[in-house]
């Protein structure tokens, strides 16, 4: 299994993946396979009304660039000295022995997985293509026969099955074949989007590819600068009883998704008032309605808030309210 995979994003469309070779490979590593797929946003983002008081906006950050080759080790340090440098405690004899045992176990387990869990598949041609993966058959553990090697306990393996696993949509993920290096720049990704990346080490190229168990890592691309800006005009219509209907277009390709809109409006000479329009409300109304406005000239600005933060305010839109109707709510049905 490739070791210590780390992923970072250096732009809104790229993720850099780095890893270390397996510690005890079965033969020579000829190449690595990297697969990636978009991850859906958390379901709670669709459920919660982020306009409700006390509800914090969801925090989503992209994967920051590497500080240094060993930046990931920072979290594992035993302590920090006054200069902020990190040092590990010296290893005891028992720790060294334990690591040797783990290394030996890992090799045995990888041999088992290699020979039993995976059926070899023919080499895929090309790079960066859609992966048809017709001949690679990943058996479920439920298909594995009785074994004598030391492996983590899995209850009652039934007899080995010779039936092939049906093709699933997962088998059409984009992938890249990496030769002679332990890094890859994945390009052409969607901005501010989470990706699940699968990394495999392979020790045979032709005629049949033999690859390790996958190592997984997740990363999110960086936000796109103007993706959360509302494009086009904010339009309005004044209905009877001075109900003002404001309408705008949602950003076409936001950073993640839009969770709310802020509507900022003010009557000439008064202070600004703010209104929050939830994702759900906007989906039904395609805007919002203002009621109970005192007569006068008004200006309105709107901005969207996505998983990455706020977009820009729109240019002000102006309208004139002629008379006053005392309606308690500012946002109408």
């Amino acid at each position: 299994v490739p070791l210590d995979p780390i992923s970072v994003s250096n732009s809104s469309s790229q993720i850099i993946l780095k890893w270390k070779p397996p510690s005890d490979p079965n033969g020579n590593i000829t190449h690595y396979l990297v697969f990636w797929e978009r991850q859906a946003e958390d379901s709670e983002l669709f459920e919660l009304d982020y306009c409700l008081k006390g509800l914090k906006l969801p925090s989503r950050t992209w994967s920051p660039p590497f500080e240094s080759e060993d930046s990931q080790k920072h979290n594992q340090s035993e302590y920090e000295d006054s200069a902020g440098e990190c040092c590990s405690c010296p290893k005891t004899d028992s720790q060294i022995l334990k690591e040797l045992e783990e290394s030996s176990f890992r090799k045995t387990f990888e041999d088992y997985l290699h020979n039993v869990v995976f059926v070899p598949r023919k080499t895929s041609s090309g790079t960066g293509a859609e992966d048809p993966r017709p001949s690679r058959k990943r058996r479920s553990l439920g298909d594995v026969g009785n074994v004598t090697v030391a492996v983590p306990t899995v209850a009652a393996f039934p007899n080995t099955s010779s039936t092939s696993v049906p093709t699933s949509p997962e088998e059409h993920r984009p992938f890249e074949k990496v030769v002679n290096k332990e890094s890859l720049v994945i390009s052409g990704l969607r901005h501010f989007t989470g990706y699940r990346i699968e990394l495999q080490a392979c020790n045979q190229d032709t005629p049949e590819e033999r690859c390790s168990v996958a190592a997984y890592v997740s990363a999110r691309t960086m936000p796109e600068a103007k993706a959360d800006d509302i494009v086009g005009p904010v339009t309005h219509e004044i209905f009877e009883n001075n109900v003002v209907h404001l309408m705008w277009q949602e950003p076409k390709e936001p950073n993640g998704l839009i969770v709310l809109y802020e509507v900022s409006y003010r009557r000439y000479g008064d202070e600004e008032l703010h209104l929050c329009v939830s994702r759900k409300h906007f989906a039904l109304e395609r805007g919002c309605r203002l009621r109970g406005l005192s007569p006068g000239n008004y200006s309105v600005r709107i901005r969207a808030t996505s998983l990455a933060g706020n977009g820009s305010w729109t240019e002000p839109t102006y309208f004139y309210v002629t008379d006053y109707l005392d309606v308690p709510s500012n946002i109408a049905k």
Epitope: N241, L257, K280, L284, E285, R286
Partner: antibody, heavy 119, light 108 residues
């Protein structure tokens, strides 16, 4: 492209239960309201209700409140219309439609599901 | 009232202009949408908001609103415009929607 695909025609007896479906694709199903519309033979369109799959918030027309149940499963991008006890008067074409374009406006429609209730 | 009233039937000579109307108190505070339905087909959105057409809808279709009446106008009616037309808006409560009874348009 944007699509709503409804389940096939149904023939039922009075008193039976039924659940018809509408599968959305090509858009964010969870964050778009979806509704149901009835059209009885030779008659006009009747607005039944709408649901927001994101949190299953549902709004029924007073005429259909308690008569049907609208639900959605966002994990499979599917909305449902359900009856616990059908009547002959439920015989109709039922359309699902997505609220899009503008407020409360159905911009995309399913092909319709014909429900026939007869003894 | 939360009802929307339409003329049951209207006819127009080929190439002429026809106006289909929809009346209801709620139209004083809400936009109307218009749908075209041909026999055996699902309805099709042809007009929404003040005067907005979805892509693919010919520009001979236009919309307007005055007081409690919304109108759909077809300027230079074509044979393929022969269909039932339904208006749709919110009811007066604002919590539900409602369709008009429909207008059958015949192109002579």
């Amino acid at each position: 492209q944007m699509q709503l695909v409804q389940s096939g025609a149904e023939v039922k007896k009075p008193g039976e239960s039924l659940k018809i479906s509408c599968k959305g694709s090509g858009y964010s199903f969870s964050s778009s309201w979806i509704g149901w519309v009835r059209q009885m033979p030779g008659k006009g369109l009747e607005w039944m209700g709408i649901i927001y799959p994101g949190d299953s918030d549902t709004r029924y027309s007073p005429s259909f409140q308690g008569q049907v149940t609208i639900s959605a499963d966002r994990s499979i991008s599917t909305a449902y219309l359900q009856w616990s006890s059908l009547k002959a008067s439920d015989t109709a074409m039922y359309y699902c439609a997505r609220v899009g374009a503008s407020g409360w406006t159905f911009d995309y429609w399913g092909q319709g599901t014909l429900v026939t209730v007869s003894s | 009232s939360s009802e929307l009233t339409q003329n049951p039937a209207v006819s127009v000579a080929l190439g002429q202009t026809v106006r289909i109307t929809c009346q209801g108190d709620s139209l004083r505070n809400y936009y109307a949408s218009w749908y075209q339905q041909k026999p055996g087909q699902a309805p099709l959105l042809v007009m929404y908001d003040r005067n907005s057409r979805p892509s693919g809808i010919p520009d001979r279709f236009s919309g307007s609103r005055s007081g409690n009446t919304a109108s759909l106008t077809i300027t230079g009616a074509q044979a393929e415009d022969e269909a039932d037309y339904y208006c749709n808006s919110r009811d007066s409560s604002g919590n539900h929607a409602v369709f008009g009874g429909g207008t059958q348009l015949t192109v002579l």
